[in-house]
């Protein structure tokens, strides 16, 4: 390891640090109503929240980024909260021949980290 | 594809959007001078810049996130600029038995995208 240890407790208070949150979105919200038929409403898990020093660091690069942000905040951005993994979703959509099912492996976040 | 097409031209002006930038850092900056011997200074490529709508979207989730951020900016954060790939780096460091070389695969960014 890079001698900097990521931490999992949020120093900013409950719900403030990088975490998974469910956002309801309709096909209209996504601009997909012309080609996706179902489901009409999606429960989209997204990564939200701040990434204070060493919180849920994705890897060595993120640990370094957090450290350098502390030293040069104008030059190096803080790590930010992004998906670490995804959960597949099946959508029913229009095709030339009718309706078909398709899986999307990168649509809904399953876990988050700071990168 | 998810019928939302990522774009590669920056609408904010040159150098403003998500890109790779080199940051010089010493072992002291990183807090590594007690265990890494060489190199004394690292050229660290990092991802910096903004992620305007559809710019360099990492995947379907990022495209959706950009769209929902436009609709619910207080609820859904904009995508942010993170590494899409890394380049390995070899460091010379102290061990109990002397000096050894170790490869770090996740230390220096090689490419960036908006996630």
């Amino acid at each position: 390891s890079a001698h900097l240890h990521p931490r999992d407790s949020c120093p900013l208070g409950p719900g403030r640090c990088c975490h998974l949150e469910t956002v309801q979105a309709t096909l209209e919200d996504l601009g997909w109503s012309d080609w996706v038929l179902s489901p009409r409403q999606l429960q989209l898990s997204m990564c939200v929240g701040e990434c204070p020093h060493l919180y849920r660091s994705a890897n060595t690069h993120a640990l370094i980024k957090a450290r350098l942000h502390g030293l040069q905040p104008d030059r190096v951005p803080a790590p930010c909260c992004v998906p670490s993994s995804y959960t597949p979703v099946v959508l029913m959509h229009r095709t030339d021949s009718g309706v078909s099912l398709q899986t999307y492996d990168d649509l809904v976040a399953q876990g988050c980290h700071c990168a | 594809s998810a019928h939302l097409h990522p774009r590669d031209s920056c609408p904010l002006g040159p150098g403003r959007c998500c890109h790779l930038e080199t940051v010089q850092a010493t072992l002291e900056d990183l807090g590594w001078s007690d265990w890494v011997l060489s190199p004394r200074q690292l050229q660290l490529s990092m991802c910096v810049g903004e992620c305007p709508h559809l710019y360099r979207s990492a995947n379907t989730h990022a495209l959706i996130k950009a769209r929902l951020h436009g609709l619910q900016p207080d609820r859904v954060p904009a995508p942010c600029c993170v590494p899409s790939s890394y380049t390995p780096v070899v460091l010379m460091h102290r061990t109990d038995s002397g000096v050894s070389l170790q490869t770090y695969d996740d230390l220096v960014a090689q490419g960036c995208h908006c996630a």
Partner: antibody, heavy 119, light 110 residues
Framework: EVQLVQSGAEVKKPGESLKISCKGS????????IGWVRQMPGKGLEWMGV????????IYSPSFQGQVTISADKSISTAYLQWSSLKASDTAMYYC????????????WGQGTLVTVSS | QSVLTQPPSVSGAPGQRVTISCSGS????????VNWYQQLPGTAPKLLIY???NRPSGVPDRFSGSKSGTSASLAITGLQAEDEADYYC??????????FGGGTKLTVLG
């Protein structure tokens, strides 16, 4: 409590028609897809098709396309599986099952409807 | 012939650990999650494990799932008489959508 209650066992002759039902309760019926699964005597599970009860969009397994019709009546929270002309080889247990949130698995199952086709 | 291959039967004594394998290909298990169902004699199938390794509430932690490459497995520890059942794996296949394994009959010895 989520429940899927299927109609009772049926004994039919070859060439006859049949419609079996699956009534959902304890959840928003139109928010989840319903699938149908066949289990022939002593055999494994076979996916037949799926319906979105909110828009009545259906998709069939290639093996069952044209052999059966899946429908739904959202006003009474019920999905259906029907045959216009039964064959002896349609003898099986038929299960309806609700899809999980992201459509990749079946989280609740009906108790099954046994269909026997014999002359 | 099922798209996903399971052993027809496995057995174990009470208290033992047994595993049931499910072998697929790059067009099914290789790209999507695997789910497991338990079918007790004379009853409907019940969801046992979803998305490779998640247990629905009410399923004992003696049951666990894992996936590696194009294969998956279900492990049952501390085998009990009431675990005697048929077990099915299920995934998604790009050509035929939802696919099941042929099923594995678990016999608890003694």
């Amino acid at each position: 409590e989520v429940q899927l209650v299927q109609s009772g066992a049926e004994v039919k002759k070859p060439g006859e028609s049949l419609k079996i039902s699956c009534k959902g309760s304890g959840y928003s019926f139109t928010s989840y897809w319903i699938g149908w699964v066949r289990q022939m005597p002593g055999k494994g599970l076979e996916w037949m098709g799926v319906i979105d009860p909110s828009g009545s969009y259906t998709i069939y397994s290639p093996s069952f396309q044209g052999q059966v019709t899946i429908s739904a009546d959202k006003s009474i929270s019920t999905a259906y599986l029907q045959w216009s002309s039964l064959k002896a080889s349609d003898t099986a247990m038929y299960y309806c099952a609700r899809y999980g949130r992201y459509g990749t698995y079946f989280d609740y199952w009906g108790q099954g409807t046994l269909v026997t086709v014999s002359s | 012939q099922s798209v996903l291959t399971q052993p027809p039967s496995v057995s174990g004594a009470p208290g033992q650990r047994v595993t049931i394998s499910c072998s697929g290909s790059s067009s099914n298990i290789g790209v999507l999650y695997v789910n497991w169902y338990q079918q007790l004699p004379g009853t409907a199938p019940k969801l046992l494990i979803y998305s490779n390794d998640n247990r629905p509430s009410g399923v004992p932690d003696r049951f666990s799932g894992s996936k590696s490459g194009t294969s998956a497995s279900l492990a049952i520890t501390g085998l009990q008489a009431e675990d005697e059942a048929d077990y099915y794996c299920q995934s998604w296949d790009s050509s035929s959508n939802y696919v099941f394994g042929g099923g594995t009959k678990l016999t608890v010895l003694g």
